[in-house]
């Protein structure tokens, strides 16, 4: 025979074709072998011109041989080489599908691989590709869009060889709150890491506000609106600054009275204060917390104490906010001026969390009277808020 070729090569099959011998022959003897694959020999009829090779190993170079037989005579042997395709990974599945994440899992191909190419595409045409290592059989997709259909495909790689792609289709779940109005709604959307988030006041996408969410303290879901930790930020600021907010949300900052008013106007909120000093910790929770609008000079409502720090905020309940340039306290002197800070001063304070960092002079520092008195400036303080009914919302989400 002559002209031996292979066609229709896959990862496990190939078709051998040849030109018949000029003379009439009784049979053709076909043998094929690959690296680490034992030789297989088959005899076929003399009028056959093709033979399907099956059960081949993937990604393997085979040597194919054929000769003709007539009686005791044997023709010379002709040879061809071919390489089977790389077989595909199997059983690609999307599990743990959330609003912005999903887990892809697959079974490896039989052939050894040098890696995998993952491609995932949303219906809007956004395509992302990622290459993962040869020992990987799962990959977490992140930053997906909620309520979106995705097609995920995977292809095995071995040097220049690429397997066929297999695919799976999944749909991310819709966000419970597409425009979360606070950190509790962000958390109920599945975000559980503390850090910067965008919230939308009253759920209005035009009213975006970047906030720091504490997702760990007492179940999480807290908007942090004050942090003192190192004294790098100046808190002896004027009325305008306290109304608008200042500082770095990741470091020391004040979120702003206008923002506090808008947030607490959205519903019933609770306040949590976390204090830390030389390894000691204390906290205070108030189950009713609100800040009035500018017309009330941001009047404070804080009621329903529980905790370990002592009820120091009660003294400030019902008070308007004071800064050195807008004195609204009930003292003859200007409390903000006297104590170099700003707060809902009365005459003057049990709490001075916006006082002078590290100043242990009487009433001048970062004070929470019923924990450390007025002659000790506390090293770390955070004030934060979340809806009073957060526990109920959280329970509902878990049941859902």
């Amino acid at each position: 025979p002559s002209g031996l070729v292979t066609a229709n090569i896959t990862d496990s099959e190939a078709l051998a074709r040849w030109q018949p011998a000029i003379a009439t022959v009784d049979s053709y003897v076909i043998s094929y072998t690959g690296e680490k694959v034992p030789e297989i020999t088959r005899t076929v009829s003399g009028n056959t011109v093709e033979y399907a090779l099956t059960d081949l190993e993937p990604a393997t170079e085979y040597t194919l041989r054929i000769f003709a037989e007539k009686g005791p005579q044997k023709s010379s042997t002709i040879t061809a080489k071919f390489t089977t395709d790389l077989d595909s990974p199997r059983d690609l599945t999307a599990t743990e599908v959330q609003s912005e994440t999903a887990l892809l899992t697959w079974r490896p191909p039989r052939a050894s691989v040098t890696g995998y190419l993952l491609v995932y595409e949303s219906v809007d045409g956004t395509v992302k590709e990622v290459i993962v290592g040869p020992d990987t059989t799962s990959y977490s997709l992140a930053d997906l869009s909620p309520s979106t259909h995705y097609t995920a495909k995977i292809q095995a790689l071995n040097g220049p060889l690429r397997s066929n792609m297999i695919q799976t289709i999944f749909t991310t779940i819709g966000l419970l709150y597409p425009f979360p109005k606070d950190c509790s709604q962000a958390m109920l959307n599945g975000d559980t890491t503390s850090g910067l988030y965008t919230i939308y006041l009253n759920g209005d996408k035009a009213e975006a506000l970047e906030v720091f969410c504490d997702m760990t303290s007492d179940g999480g879901g807290w908007i942090v609106f004050l942090r003192r930790k190192n004294g790098r930020e100046n808190f002896y600021q004027n009325w305008k600054a306290y109304a608008a907010g200042f500082g770095d949300r990741r470091e020391e900052f004040w979120l702003g009275l206008d923002n506090l008013n808008k947030i607490t106007a959205q519903g019933q909120y609770e306040l949590r204060v976390d204090l830390r000093d030389h390894g000691e910790t204390a906290f205070a929770v108030y189950d009713k917390f609100s800040v009035g609008d500018a017309k009330t000079r941001y009047k404070l409502k804080v009621e329903g104490y529980s905790g370990t720090a002592g009820d120091s905020m009660a003294y400030h309940n019902g008070r308007s906010f004071s800064t050195f340039d807008k004195d609204t306290d009930s003292a003859i002197t200007n409390c903000a001026l006297s104590y170099k800070g700003a707060f809902w001063y009365r005459n003057c304070h049990r709490v001075n969390l916006m006082g002078r960092y590290g100043d242990n002079n009487h009433s001048q520092g970062v004070n929470w009277f019923h924990w450390k008195g007025h002659e000790h400036s506390i090293q770390f303080a955070e004030m934060k808020l979340r809806p009073s009914n957060f526990r109920n919302l959280e329970g509902r989400r878990k049941r859902a």
Epitope: A314, N317, G318, S330, R346, N347
Partner: antibody
Framework: QVQLVESGGGLVQPGRSLRLSCAAS????????MHWVRQAPGKGLEWVSG????????YYADSVKGRFTISRDNAKNSLYLQMNSLRAEDTALYYC?????????????WGQGTMVTVSS | DIQMTQSPSSLSASVGDRVTITCRAS??????LNWYQQKPGKAPKLLIY???NLETGVPSRFSGSGSGTDFTLTISSLQPEDFATYYC?????????FGQGTKVDIK
């Protein structure tokens, strides 16, 4: 109107016990801290004990610590002072006083007082 | 404990006089100071809280001032019903303590 009425005073021998009561009306009782303040005959005012609105926190003057116990029953709008191991120096007019809203250490309403005389 | 010292212990004045009573705390108390009036056989009555805030219903002839350790109660024009004993009280820390009292009587 807001009113506090004390009762339970009387003559008692040293070492004995007495329980004072204070009935409150005209305000949301459990929103406010409550206190006992006493005044020995012809003398000034001395704070004795205080209790938070919920009853969860109690405070005492050193002179009565370990002998007196303050308590409240918010369902009955009532404040109590259990006085044990009474001494002659506990003789005084005992006033029940309401703490001011916000921080309860300013006394904005007072009862008329109940007299406790400790004598053998 | 914080000691509160009032002066004078007593004073005699006439109707229409301006009367000033001082109170000194043994340690810094910001503005955590209250003034009470007590008439014979009656319970004390809150006049001034937070050093300078007039309690509801108290006549405006009464005023308070001061912060830190030194405080003053002033009656701008003494009236017949003002003859009584006046006490200062610190509400800064427990135990809340009173001054020894200032008795204002008719000259």
């Amino acid at each position: 109107q807001v009113q506090l009425v004390e009762s339970g005073g009387g003559l008692v021998q040293p070492g004995r016990s007495l329980r004072l009561s204070c009935a409150a009306s005209g305000f949301t009782f459990d929103d406010y801290a409550m206190h006992w303040v006493r005044q020995a005959p012809g003398k000034g005012l001395e704070w004795v004990s205080g209790i938070s609105g919920s009853g969860g926190s109690t405070y005492y003057a050193d002179s009565v610590k370990g002998r007196f116990t303050i308590s409240r029953d918010n369902a009955k709008n009532s404040l109590y002072l259990q006085m044990n191991s009474l001494r002659a120096e506990d003789t005084a007019l005992y006033y029940c006083a309401k703490g001011q809203k916000g921080e309860g250490d300013t006394f904005d309403i007072w009862g008329q007082g109940t007299m406790v005389t400790v004598s053998s | 404990d914080i000691q509160m010292t009032q002066s004078p212990s007593s004073l005699s004045a006439s109707v229409g006089d301006r009367v000033t009573i001082t109170c000194r705390a043994s340690q810094y108390i910001q503005g955590f100071l209250n003034w009470y009036q007590q008439k014979p056989g009656k319970a004390p009555k809150l006049l001034i809280y937070d050093a300078s805030n007039l309690e509801t219903g108290v006549p405006s002839r009464f005023s308070g001032s001061g912060s830190g350790t030194d405080f003053t109660l002033t009656i701008s024009s003494l009236q017949p019903e003002d003859f009584a004993t006046y006490y200062c009280q610190q509400s800064y820390s427990t135990p809340q303590t009173f001054g020894q009292g200032t008795k204002v009587d008719i000259k």
